[in-house]
Amino acid sequence: EPPTACREKQYLINSQCCSLCQPGQKLVSDCTEFTETECLPCGESEFLDTWNRETHCHQHKYCDPNLGLRVQQKGTSETDTICTCEEGWHCTSEACESCVLHRSCSPGFGVKQIATGVSDTICEPCPVGFFSNVSSAFEKCHPWTSCETKDLVVQQAGTNKTDVVCGPQDRLR
């Protein structure tokens, strides 16, 4: 009686179970009563990453340099090429099909996490006691100057964008 289901890494065809091709290989011909499944390795710049019955391998992804992409990991017969972006740029999606500039954190905001090839700069507002007076992709919020430790007093309060201004203590004569 012909099978209705096959084991793992097999497929049903013409009422019989044939072996799937292993990753990195494509199907040339199905098995028969007398022969095994015939598979062939994927060619240069091609891959298949699963046990399969595909008759064509997939082309490796092209990391288009005109889009700012470069190869992070070269593809193999079993894996696709992984692209990343040039320094100063990051991928617009997980698939990394194009790149955008790293954003800067505006004054009043500091860098919480520096950008990478796959993620943008993460900014955070400077909390009370901290400031940032520049637009930067690297600078964290800086703590206000401690006037007391310099034996000075606060002459002008700090904000999230400006440091405190220290001045001499009034001397009683």
């Epitope: 005109n66 889009l67 700012g68 040039e86 100063g88 740029w89 194009s98 790149c99 955008v100 992709a137």
Partner: antibody, heavy 112, light 112 residues
């Protein structure tokens, strides 16, 4: 795929000017575009770049002197207060770290 | 800012000769360097990017090499059509988060 600049003309110093780069055959949401200029008989000078998301960065010397913005098929370069030193041919160029597609350029002459 | 020093400013050579143009960066730019050819009245044309990768359609007579701060463009079997000005262009993203695109001063190649 092509890019073409327009808007170049003779202006007096301080007269605001907007140059436009019109692209066809590719998407500005994917590609970055730069403005580069060339004074008569001189070399090339990078002004700034705008990415697919519309974020722009500028050369240190160009900050505050130029503004780059974009729409669906155009990239604008605004010169809010040009001086005689801004006399040049202005090119629009596509690319991230290098530029593989350039327009023919548009000539800006600033003279009193 | 990065400064690109290009030498020589001008070179004269005969058809069939080999011409070498050098470009020196004021600090290391890894391999982020491109070479362009510009003829009078035309925009620059990309020849080589990433220091040594030949742009599609560019004859293999053009060869780029180098990394770090020293780069070379070699034109072999010189042809009349190679008479032009050649520019190097660097890209650098600094640790301060600024973007720097710099062009060399150009080299005029005269073909005898």
């Amino acid at each position: 795929q092509s890019v073409e600049e327009s808007g170049g003309r003779l202006v007096t110093p301080g007269t605001p000017l907007t140059l436009t780069c019109t692209v066809s055959g590719f998407s500005l949401s994917t590609y970055a575009m730069s403005w580069v200029r060339q004074a008569p008989g001189k070399g090339l000078e990078w002004i700034g770049i705008i990415d697919g998301g519309g974020f722009a960065v500028y050369a240190n010397w160009a900050k505050g002197r130029f503004t780059i913005s974009k729409a669906s098929t155009t990239v604008d370069l605004k010169l809010p207060s040009p001086t005689t030193e801004d006399t040049a041919t202005y090119f629009c160029a596509r690319g991230v770290t290098f530029f593989n597609l350039w327009g023919p350029g548009t000539l800006v002459t600033v003279s009193s | 800012d990065i400064v690109m020093t290009q030498t020589p400013a001008s070179v004269e050579a005969a058809v069939g000769d080999t011409v070498t143009i050098k470009c020196q960066a004021s600090q290391s730019i890894s391999s982020a360097l491109a070479w362009y050819q510009q003829k009078p009245g035309q925009p620059p044309k990309l020849l080589i990017y990433r220091a040594s990768t030949l742009e599609s359609g560019v004859p293999s007579r053009f060869k780029g090499s180098g990394s770090g701060t020293e780069f070379t463009l070699t034109i072999s079997d010189l042809e009349c059509a190679d008479a032009a000005t050649y520019y190097c262009q660097s890209y650098y993203y600094s640790s301060g988060g600024s973007y720097d695109y710099a062009f060399g001063g150009g080299t005029e190649v005269v073909v005898k």
